[in-house]
Interface confidence: low
């Protein structure tokens, strides 16, 4: 018995279906086919769980969180024992193993391994200003999304004709911050943060209004 090598890792957007491949060759009839799919969740590597089982000609549910979402892609028994997972959740991310036994065919590699990563687009980021907006001050524009896998990067731009940040600005696309030093009237305007990752983008807007000092009355 020989389980074919998996293509490696699979990525899928949250909520979408995933197909985890597992095929094998065998010299025996599929009368005593035994298949166990296991997952070692990324979120809890110490607690492997059963996903779905095929034993004695019957299919069995694994862990309750997979009930109703998992099945074999084809009619069993078969040498293609790939499974689908519908409505993928973040908690489905992990390393999946198919363990195949088909007596009396013993020996060879009877385990296939596939990684599954459930991707999440960035949630609507939160934009805010830190610091005084008085002319000559330093301000920090902050941008962060609560959700996003892979971790989003953040790009700030000023919504004027150039889409460029003021020359006194420095940007950190990982942290989502822009520091603008010595703000002036020219710093005023609408700023947009674009949070993006492999499967999506999301934006928020911020209105920076630099406050000019009030003229002093001479009397």
């Amino acid at each position: 018995l020989e389980v074919s090598e998996s293509p490696g890792s699979i990525q899928v957007a949250r909520g979408q279906p995933a197909v985890l491949p597992c095929t094998f060759t065998t010299s025996a009839a599929l009368i005593n086919l035994n298949v166990i799919w296991m997952v070692t969740p990324l979120s809890n590597a110490n607690q492997p769980e059963q996903v779905i089982l095929y034993q004695g000609g019957q299919m069995f549910d694994g862990a309750p969180r997979f009930h109703g979402r998992v099945g074999f892609t084809g009619t069993m028994p078969a040498t293609n024992v790939s499974i689908f997972i519908n409505n993928t959740q973040l908690s489905d991310t992990g390393t999946y193993q198919c363990l195949v036994n088909n007596l009396p065919d013993i020996g060879g590699r009877n385990i296939g391994v596939t990684g599954l990563t459930v991707l999440v687009p960035p949630s609507a980021p939160h934009c805010q200003i830190q610091g005084s907006q008085d002319i000559g001050s330093d301000v920090i524009l902050l941008c962060s999304s609560e959700e996003g896998i892979p971790r989003p990067t953040y790009l700030w731009e000023k919504l004027d004709n150039t889409l460029k940040l003021p020359p006194t600005a420095t940007q950190d696309q990982v942290q989502g911050t822009v520091t603008i030093r010595n703000i002036s009237a020219l710093s005023s305007g609408l700023y947009q943060c674009v949070a993006s990752n492999a499967i999506g983008t999301s934006t928020c807007l911020l209105d920076l209004q630099v406050i000019s000092p009030q003229p002093r009355n001479i009397g």
């Epitope: 607690q47 059963q50 034993q55 549910d61 694994g62 309750p64 109703g68």
Partner: antibody, heavy 127, light 108 residues
């Protein structure tokens, strides 16, 4: 209130059929496996059958396999047990029980326990 | 088929410790649960996964499981603990429950 309420029991002749129902309330029915456990008069508990939360998997004791069918309607929060070819030894109080199934690991099967029970319904098989 | 053996009866004085045993082949390799059933009532889960107590079950109920024997221990036994007690294990996911024959606990 979290509860299970069985119905459908009664007197039936040997070889006859009966359908038991169990109405669940107070919890998310579709998230739980469910089971039937019976108790003959003056005797101990005997597990009869179980069904997964989705209804995709069913399990039976050898003593009822081929005669009893467990099913569920998640839209109605109801569990069923269709009992055919009834025998005198099937006479018992039939309890509906919520089954917790905890997944096994690579080296062990999962295990079951029953954390919520109904009041039971009596099935008498006699001529 | 897998069998669980329990003593038919156990007696204990109020305030003393009662131990009810359940034996089966390599029982320690499986998880045991215990149920209490009072006359005319349905069973109540008192211990699961060998030693875990559901909410609402008094702390005087405890459980252990090793080798071929699982044990339910009731410390400071009270009159209200008088009941039948059943142990239960799974033979695997395909067989949800194997119950012991039950033990009648009498509080003298």
């Amino acid at each position: 209130e979290v509860q299970l309420l069985e119905s459908g029991g009664g007197l039936v002749q040997p070889g006859g059929s009966l359908r038991l129902s169990c109405a669940a309330s107070g919890f998310t029915f579709s998230s739980y496996a469910m089971s039937w456990v019976r108790q003959a008069p003056g005797k101990g508990l005997e597990w009869v059958s179980a069904i997964s939360g989705s209804g995709g998997s069913t399990y039976y004791a050898d003593s009822v396999k081929g005669r009893f069918t467990i099913s569920r309607d998640n839209s109605k929060n109801t569990l069923y047990l269709q009992m055919n070819s009834l025998r005198a030894e099937d006479t018992a109080v039939y309890y509906c029980a919520r089954g917790q199934y905890v997944s096994g690991t690579y080296y062990s099967y999962g295990y079951w326990y029953f954390d919520l029970w109904g009041r039971g319904t009596l099935v008498t098989v006699s001529s | 088929s897998y069998e669980l053996t329990q003593p038919p009866s156990v007696s204990v004085s109020p305030g003393q410790t009662a131990s009810i045993t359940c034996s089966g082949d390599k029982l320690g390799d499986k998880y045991a649960s215990w149920y209490q059933q009072k006359p005319g009532q349905s069973p109540v889960l008192v211990i699961y996964q060998d030693s875990k107590r559901p909410s609402g079950i008094p702390e005087r109920f405890s459980g252990s499981n090793s080798g071929n024997t699982a044990t339910l221990t009731i410390s400071g036994t009270q009159a209200e603990d008088e009941a039948d007690y059943y142990c239960q294990v799974s033979r695997g996911h395909t067989s949800a429950g194997v119950f012991g024959g039950g033990t009648k606990l009498t509080v003298l």
